[in-house]
Interface confidence: medium
Amino acid sequence: TLNSVLINSNAIKNLPPPLGGAGGQPGSAVSVAPGVLYEGGNKYQTLDNYQPYPCAEDEECGSDEYCSSPSRGAAGVGGVQICLACRKRRKRCMRHAMCCPGNYCKNGICMPSDHSHFPRGEIEESIIENLGNDHNAAAGDGYPRRTTLTSKIYHTKGQEGSVCLRSSDCAAGLCCARHFWSKICKPVLKEGQVCTKHKRKGSHGLEIFQRCYCGEGLACRIQKDHHQASNSSRLHTCQRH
């Protein structure tokens, strides 16, 4: 259901401003208040983990997903959108959120990013192309889209803890991740830090305390020496490819 909540999805694309999430130091085992599991009897535990997750905005999806109409050519019939798998390098795109972490949308194609492809003070602005099948870039659905943002911001990039709407609002080495009240700039995860991996596509609700994604050259994988009774609760950490 739209109200199901999973505490620990890694959905960090385009988070809103942090109302105040805190976090660990870049070298600590758990990064700054990223993806913290809820205590207190699973206060916000999700009920229906394995439903395709309905969404209205990319922010509600995982870092390896974007929000779009599920059926090709359906033109968003009934306005139903779900979280879909991100597009890999060289795949077609309409906006940055469609591309997998480490990539951005340039001239309608997902390209590798090196965190320096946007001049300081500019927000990424993708070129809208008619891909024919992805309809959630339409501006008429009542939800703001990254593609309709103004191209310039006139403030300096946000430091850790600054409220943000998207990762381009944050300084290098930080991503924009939800910290409940808002989205804030949090450190991109380093090797060995705990990360969050969705068990299955669309298996999450709106994450409240999000972790950033793993940094360049790292992937979120099960920690080899981590043995727990439940497969579903295995610890994932950022590891070298």
């Epitope: 739209l2 109200n3 809103p16 401003p17 942090p18 109302l19 105040g20 999430g21 805190a22 976090g23 660990g24 130091q25 758990v30 700054v32 208040a33 913290v36 809820y38 205590e39 207190g40 206060k43 916000y44 905005e57 509600e60 703001p144 850790e160 803890g161 409220v163 709407l165 939800r178 910290h179 409940f180 009240w181 808002s182 989205k183 709106l206 409240i208």
Partner: antibody, heavy 110, light 112 residues
Framework: EVQLVQSGAEVKKPGASVKVSCKAS????????IHWVRQAPGQGLEWMGW????????TYAQKFQARVTMSRDTSSSTAYMELSRLESDDTAMYFC?????WGQGTLVTV | QSVLTQPPSVSGAPGQRVTISCTGS?????????VHWYQQLPGTAPKLLIY???NRPSGVPDRFSGSKSGASASLAITGLRPDDEADYYC???????????FGGGTQLTVLS
Amino acid sequence: EVQLVQSGAEVKKPGASVKVSCKASGYTFTDYYIHWVRQAPGQGLEWMGWIHSNSGATTYAQKFQARVTMSRDTSSSTAYMELSRLESDDTAMYFCSREDYWGQGTLVTV
Amino acid sequence: QSVLTQPPSVSGAPGQRVTISCTGSSSNIGAGYDVHWYQQLPGTAPKLLIYGYSNRPSGVPDRFSGSKSGASASLAITGLRPDDEADYYCQSYDNSLSSYVFGGGTQLTVLS
């Protein structure tokens, strides 16, 4: 169980300072920000600022910038909010919040 | 004067549906910042009802729902009950103030 327990009610004279504490338990203190929100009698909620429990970095609402100091003691998992140069309209209930959990409130009467 | 505008009061009979609006601007709700809703009973701390526009924490009945349109958000309560009588606040972030902001609050009265 996550809990935020605040210090007891305070009565202060105008011009004085007050320091309210907020002791956290049931979670990793340094993984969260602590916000302070106040509510004058019969009035709405007003955000005062937050402190990053790990680094101690703070952000204050402009209105309180010159008078408020937020601090924390990681060894005791306690956050503090000190408000100086008190005036009668600072009479309010002061809440600390981890965003999803709130303290019970501390009544400060000036 | 609050940055987020709520009606001072609303009322309804038991079983009825009421909505509480929260009107912001392009620097808060309209900019895409989340809206959260709190219920506050007299003498208690605010309790989270809705977060991220429309998400309910567990334990909050599905009679409570939230939505957003443009620079406004609203809270709907169906099947009104006497114990719903409380103050309700919306909350967001305002980038022109660099501050978290609350609505002025709405007092809900359940008519007997």
